[in-house]
């Protein structure tokens, strides 16, 4: 699998899309997981509704949401209030039994807010009362990693 890069701005929302063959993956739930190290396991962040018929419902785990267009064949993940620690390698997965097929490998990059002149360590976190409806969803910038590019920094 090639790795697709999605870039988002700190403090804003990032939308990641994972296209797939809707017939091949018919009846399968989907998941979004975070790769723990280059050879490590992929830790589940959020998955679609247990009832495949209701895969279109947006399900949240913390600041991450997932929703599946099972007819169009597009899995969409939203990372709300993007933070530097959200950067890293992820996977969109199609689940069947205890197995998981990788739909897409995704590298999330977090860019500093160009309008934020404060220190990088002094990022704004929205209060609990602020709803997602008020948030501005940035169109993500995506590209595929070039051959030889390493999604993980080399470990010493």
């Amino acid at each position: 699998h090639n790795t697709t890069v999605f870039q988002g701005v700190a403090g804003q929302s990032l939308q990641v899309s994972c296209p797939y063959d809707s017939m091949k993956h018919w009846g399968r739930r989907k998941a979004w997981c975070r790769q723990l190290g280059e050879k490590g396991p992929c830790q589940r962040v959020v998955s679609t509704h247990n009832l495949w018929l209701l895969s279109f419902l947006r399900r949240w785990n913390g600041s991450t949401a997932i929703t599946d267009d099972t007819l169009g064949g597009t899995l969409t993940i939203t990372l709300r209030n993007l933070q530097p620690h959200d950067a890293g390698l992820y996977q969109c997965q199609s689940l069947h039994g205890s197995e998981a097929d990788t739909l897409r490998k995704v590298l999330v990059e977090v860019l500093a807010d160009p309008l934020d002149h404060r220190d990088a360590g002094d990022l704004w976190f929205p209060g609990e009362s602020e709803s997602f409806e008020d948030a501005h969803v940035e169109h993500s910038i995506s590209r595929s990693l070039l051959e030889g590019e390493i999604p993980f920094p080399p470990t010493s």
Partner: antibody
Framework: QVQLVQSGAEVKKPGASVKVSCKAS????????MHWVRQAPGQGLEWMGI????????SYAQKFQGRVTMTRDTSTSTVYMELSSLRSEDTAVYYC?????????????????WGKGTTVTVSS | DIQMTQSPSSLSASVGDRVTITCRAS??????LNWYQQKPGKAPKLLIY???SLQSGVPSRFSGSGSGTDFTLTISSLQPEDFATYYC?????????FGGGTKVEIK
């Protein structure tokens, strides 16, 4: 107006099967899912499963797997729920209830229109 | 399965009273929580969906709040037609599950 009309009361013997119908009117039948919920005498509500009238796909609560079958007839805008191997504990009022159908990125899910219910009595 | 626990199971109140019913989920269900009203011999009626959204045609004296695991249904000023049983229901997970119900009786 939107309406779900259910079939009449049934009395069945243990081990038999029952088939309850629910006829929809006043809306586009294939645009909404249909759920079945039952209520034993003096008890609470219990969700049994869901059917997509558009394609006929179903999903049943684990408790009823192997005993329940939900089908639909798009020509008459009717859904059916068949429960087999009946026992006395299946004595209940069975409701069909409409829920939002396939859409994109919905942040809520409910059952907004209900049938009046069909009483099923299982007795020897 | 997600367990939905309602309290109290019954309460007595007078017309004009403010009534509060609580519902607790055994795990987070975000805001996938609905409230239904049921009168004897009748089908349930949707009052509140998505924890706090009022269903069309439902009087504004009904309101809902909460997210995660703890939810509340409030009737600001109880009317004679509100004496009924109220159920919460989660739709975040399979199977959908209901609370045991709260019967609101006349004092």
């Amino acid at each position: 107006q939107v309406q779900l009309v259910q079939s009449g009361a049934e009395v069945k013997k243990p081990g038999a099967s029952v088939k309850v119908s629910c006829k929809a009117s006043g809306y586009t039948f294939t645009s909404y899912y249909m759920h079945w919920v039952r209520q034993a005498p003096g008890q609470g509500l219990e969700w049994m499963g869901i059917i997509n009238p558009s394609g006929g796909s179903t999903s049943y609560a684990q408790k009823f797997q192997g005993r329940v079958t939900m089908t639909r007839d798009t020509s008459t805008s009717t859904v059916y729920m068949e429960l087999s191997s009946l026992r006395s504990e299946d004595t209940a009022v069975y409701y069909c209830a409409r829920g939002p159908g396939y859409t994109t990125a919905l942040d809520y899910y409910y059952m907004d229109v209900w049938g009046k219910g069909t009483t099923v009595t299982v007795s020897s | 399965d997600i367990q939905m626990t309602q309290s109290p199971s019954s309460l007595s109140a007078s017309v004009g009273d403010r009534v509060t019913i609580t519902c607790r989920a055994s795990q987070s269900i975000n805001s996938y929580l609905n409230w239904y009203q049921q009168k004897p011999g009748k089908a349930p009626k949707l009052l509140i969906y998505a924890a706090s959204s009022l269903q069309s045609g439902v009087p504004s004296r009904f309101s809902g709040s909460g997210s995660g695991t703890d939810f509340t249904l409030t009737i600001s000023s109880l009317q004679p037609e509100d004496f009924a049983t109220y159920y919460c229901q989660q739709s975040d997970d399979d199977p959908f599950t209901f609370g045991g119900g709260t019967k609101v009786e006349i004092k």
